[in-house]
Structures are given as structure tokens and as C-alpha cells.
């Protein structure tokens, strides 16, 4: 027997405005930096890639997804120390023998010039100047992203 | 030399209101279900645990984190079919030989009674009635969560 709270929950908010616009961030939270239409969080602590992915997720954000070379350069310009590496949301898919973004898309070979091997347990990091393949177990910093503006029709239905 | 856009970005929005309240969802997106102060997304499709984590992340949400037995029971009450399993944000940390939530905390042994082995490549799923350890590579459904209300002082400093 479901309690009234579950009954309310199962009804997928029929009474609310069924707009497909989700609230979205109007400005970036403290400690996050705005870069165009994104908010970026550059970690100070270090983690393996998997933990970095999980950390961004628990912050209701994503490991950084980079659309093109231009966005890469602008992101790298925000890195203040040449020696620091940051995980982004790209790793090697062994089954598909290709670099794969965490949103399921594959790397366009023109987008990033990767230094290092494309092999099992390889994940991608960026520095102020370069893009590197590293063992995913390496503990380095990472970059989370949130979309800044309300996104129309980015519905996120049920999964 | 930084362009004006980067200068603006590096300045972490000094001019904006420095509240530690981030916008938060005021109501749940379409297809998501409200359960207390969370929006839950019960997937219909299936994925390995890692892909489920990534999917929630790209939705700027998290695989489900369960605080206590009470929240587990209320979540299970929303599952409509006894035979369906859903990934949550808990897996086995080989290095720490313990169940670990994706937010970095360890499972309190009193919270969930897990059926199955605690070993490498084990991830946690829930059904309408139980909590199971499964191979993380198994393709099952998953549950994403978003916090519903604005959360004061949840600052997300650097990580």
C-alpha cells in the first residue's frame, strides 16, 4: 500500500506547468568560473578519473566536455600553472577502440591533438598548453562543468 | 595575454550577489518524479553501471544516493515491477575493501542489507524489495537524482 507521499510522487507532477524548459543556472555558483555558456569548477584536490567523474556527478555537473579547439584554448587560458593537469570527460573505450566522451560521442580526430597512447585504462587530461593521455588511475585535478543558461527542450525525460 | 572574455571568467563573478544559495530546481522536470526533496529519474533503458553514472552526470544529476533505510523504502515504493533492478551510486572499492558511495562516503553497514558478494567489479542495484550486488558490467536500469529545493550553503568549493 503506497502512502500519500508516494502517490503524489508517482503522479509525475500533472498539476505543474509542463514546460520543457528546465530552470538552468542564471549565474555560476561561488568558486565556479564562467566561460561563455558554461560554469567550470577547477578542482584543487586530486583524484583518479573515475572518482573525478563521480565527484562532478554528485555536484550535479559533468566532467568537462569540449566541443572544439576554440573551447579547448579558452579553457586552457583559465589554467594558471603550466605544470597542472586536469581530467576531462574523455577516456579510451577498449571495446570500440576509440576515444569516447562521457556523453557517448566519439572524439573527432581534428578536435584535440593527444600526446600519449590510445589504449586500455587511458583517460584524457589537459594542461595549460597540451592534451595528454594518462593512466586513468593517476591522481590529478579535474574540471566539472554546468550549463549556465536555461536550455529549452533539453528534456531529460525519464531515463 | 588573456582576452577580455577570459579576464571576465577568471574574475569569479565578483559583481554578482555572493549568496551561497545556488538556484536549484523548484519542481521536477518532465518524466522525473518527486520524492521528498529530490527529483528521481527511473530509467527505462539499460546500461552498465559506468555508463549509468555518466548518463546521470551528463544530465547534471547524480546516480541515486540513499541516506538511510527510510529513504530506501520510499524509493523502492516507486518501483512498479518486482523483477526490475536499478543501479544506484554505490560500488565496491577494491583499494578500500568497502562499499563506497560516489560522493566518497562509505556505506554504513546498518543502512542497506546487500544480497551478494562484496568484491571487485561489484556495483549495487535495488529492486522493489531488495538490494543486490551485481557485476558492474551488467546492463540494467538506473536511477538519477537531482536535489529539488535550493540548498543554502552547499557551496561546492573546489572539490
Amino acid at each position: 500500500q503506497k502512502s500519500s507521499i508516494e502517490k503524489c510522487s508517482v503522479d509525475i507532477q500533472q498539476s505543474r506547468n509542463k514546460t520543457t524548459e528546465r530552470p538552468g543556472l542564471l549565474n555560476c555558483p561561488i568558486y565556479w568560473q564562467q566561460l561563455r555558456e558554461k560554469c567550470l569548477l577547477f578542482s584543487h584536490t586530486v583524484n583518479p578519473w573515475n572518482n573525478s567523474l563521480a565527484d562532478c556527478s554528485t555536484k550535479e555537473s559533468s566532467l568537462l566536455l569540449i566541443r572544439d579547439k576554440d573551447e579547448l584554448i579558452h579553457t586552457q587560458n583559465l589554467i594558471r600553472d603550466k605544470a597542472i593537469l586536469f581530467w576531462i570527460g574523455l577516456n579510451f573505450s577498449l571495446s570500440e577502440k576509440n576515444w569516447k566522451w562521457i556523453n557517448g560521442s566519439f572524439l573527432n580526430s581534428n578536435d584535440l591533438e593527444i600526446r600519449g597512447d590510445a589504449k586500455e585504462n587511458s583517460c584524457i587530461s589537459i594542461s595549460q598548453t597540451s592534451v595528454y593521455s594518462e593512466y586513468c588511475s593517476t591522481e590529478i585535478r579535474w574540471i566539472c562543468q554546468k550549463e549556465l543558461t536555461p536550455v529549452r527542450n533539453k528534456v531529460y525525460p525519464d531515463s | 595575454q588573456k582576452s577580455s572574455i577570459e579576464k571576465c571568467s577568471v574574475d569569479i563573478q565578483q559583481s554578482r550577489n555572493k549568496t551561497t544559495e545556488r538556484p536549484g530546481l523548484l519542481n521536477c522536470p518532465i518524466y522525473w518524479q518527486q520524492l521528498r526533496e529530490k527529483c528521481l529519474l527511473f530509467s527505462h533503458t539499460v546500461n552498465p553501471w559506468n555508463n549509468s553514472l555518466a548518463d546521470c552526470s551528463t544530465k547534471e544529476s547524480s546516480l541515486l544516493l540513499i541516506r538511510d533505510k527510510d529513504e530506501l523504502i520510499h524509493t523502492q515504493n516507486l518501483i512498479r515491477d518486482k523483477a526490475i533492478l536499478f543501479w544506484i551510486g554505490l560500488n565496491f572499492s577494491l583499494s578500500e575493501k568497502n562499499w563506497k558511495w560516489i560522493n566518497g562516503s562509505f556505506l554504513n553497514s546498518n543502512d542497506l542489507e546487500i544480497r551478494g558478494d562484496a568484491k571487485e567489479n561489484s556495483c549495487i542495484s535495488i529492486s522493489q524489495t531488495s538490494v543486490y550486488s551485481e557485476y558492474c558490467s551488467t546492463e540494467i536500469r538506473w536511477i538519477c537524482q537531482k536535489e529539488l529545493t535550493p540548498v543554502r550553503n552547499k557551496v561546492y568549493p573546489d572539490s
Epitope: I12, G104, F106, P157, S159 | Y31, H44, V46, P48, W142
Partner: antibody, heavy 121, light 107 residues
């Protein structure tokens, strides 16, 4: 441009085989479960098969179970339908379709133009 | 399998009319219903999902309602481009099923 493009249809004799392909572009193909839907001449829509984003889980309509096999190659952004033991009642336009959200099977917001399969002696 | 029964199977209407199509599910499907429009020789087009949510780019004269087993698609002020066949589809459980279709014809 966001699109799906089917190919591989044609005329085949009963008992024969065909392999349909669907090339995806403009979206993150590997994030989505995908389906095949068919439409017999002058008839309604019938869901045929679905495959999970990672490709490890497949489902079929009873009418094609054991004869059709759905598969995908995420590195090539391509969906396939291998059709064996074809029957006259399999004659239809076959569409590949993408769901609105990565965690949905249905609510198809993107369809291909379709490819016609004719099973006749 | 969940059966979806659409009615009417066809309707004759004029430009400016209000048209209502219903879809009944053989068992409860919560709000997991979508509506599609299909024109001859073309692929279907998603109009409404989650029973009442309007898909991006679809004119606001289209609306959906209902929950459980009974659902409705309404076209307010029918336009010339709206003459087509409309299908409902449930996404509650596999196999995905479609209604038999409703043809909206010019009176």
C-alpha cells in the same frame, strides 16, 4: 545536421535475407537506445526491435523474434537490422528511430526517411 | 502486450475546426503516451510526449491530455497542413505499441 539515413532495402524472395543499415549523424549516437519501426503499405506503425546504447541488450516484437537481429557499431554511428527467413508479411517501409532522451526506449523525436523492403516471389 | 485503441479511425473536418482524437490503453500507462503526425510518404513526426508535453517546434494549437488509460489529442483551429494521420504510442513497457491511427481528412 541531425539525421538518420536507412539503406539496404530492396526486393527479396520469401525465405531470403537482407541487412538494413541506419547511419546516424549530428547527435551522440552512442548515448541512445535505438529502434526499428516498420509500416506495411497502407497500414499503421509497428515497432520491430530495440537495442540499448551500449549494445548488450536487445528486444524484439514477437512477429520477428528468432528471425531478425538488431545490432550497432557505435564507433561507426550505425544501427543494423539483419533480417532472415523473410516472409511476405515483412513487406514494409523500415524506419530507424531515436528516442527523445538517452534513458528512454521510445518517444521518437528523430526518424529516418525509411527504406522499403519487399518480400515477393 | 499493451493494446492502444484509437478513435475515431477517421474524421472529416474543415480548416478552423477543433478536432479531438482519443487513445485508450488496455492497462494503465501513467503518463507514458506520445502522439505522432504522419503525412503520406513521410516519416512520423513527434508532436506530444509524456501525455501533454509539446515537442519543440510543434505549434501550440496541438495539445495532449490524459493519464492512466484514457488520453486525448486536441487540434485547435485546424490548419491546412494538419490534414494527416495521427498515431498514439505507449512507452510504459516493452514492446512499444502504437494505436491504429486516425486519419484527419478535409470535409
Amino acid at each position: 545536421e541531425v539525421q538518420l539515413l536507412e539503406s539496404g532495402g530492396g526486393l527479396v524472395q520469401p525465405g531470403g535475407s537482407l541487412r538494413l543499415s541506419c547511419a546516424a549523424s549530428g547527435f551522440t549516437f552512442g548515448q541512445y537506445a535505438m529502434s526499428w519501426v516498420r509500416q506495411a503499405p497502407g497500414k499503421g506503425l509497428e515497432w520491430v526491435s530495440a537495442i540499448s546504447a551500449a549494445g548488450g541488450t536487445t528486444y524484439y516484437a514477437d512477429s520477428v523474434k528468432g528471425r531478425f537481429t538488431i545490432s550497432r557499431d557505435n564507433s561507426k554511428n550505425t544501427l543494423y537490422l539483419q533480417m532472415n527467413s523473410l516472409r511476405a508479411e515483412d513487406t514494409a517501409v523500415y524506419y530507424c528511430a531515436k528516442p527523445l532522451d538517452s534513458s528512454q526506449w521510445a518517444d521518437f523525436d528523430l526518424w529516418g526517411r525509411g527504406t522499403l523492403v519487399t518480400v515477393s516471389s | 502486450d499493451i493494446q492502444l485503441t484509437q478513435s475515431p479511425s477517421s474524421v472529416s473536418a474543415s480548416v478552423g475546426d477543433r478536432v479531438t482524437i482519443t487513445c485508450r490503453a488496455s492497462q494503465g500507462i501513467s503518463s507514458w503516451l506520445a502522439w505522432y503526425q504522419q503525412k503520406p510518404g513521410k516519416a512520423p513526426k513527434l508532436l506530444i510526449y509524456a501525455a501533454s508535453s509539446l515537442q519543440s517546434g510543434v505549434p501550440s494549437r496541438f495539445s495532449g491530455s490524459g493519464s492512466g488509460t484514457d488520453f486525448t489529442l486536441t487540434i485547435n483551429s485546424l490548419q491546412p497542413e494538419d490534414f494527416a494521420t495521427y498515431y498514439c504510442q505507449q512507452a510504459w513497457v516493452l514492446p512499444i505499441t502504437f494505436g491504429g491511427g486516425t486519419k484527419v481528412e478535409i470535409k
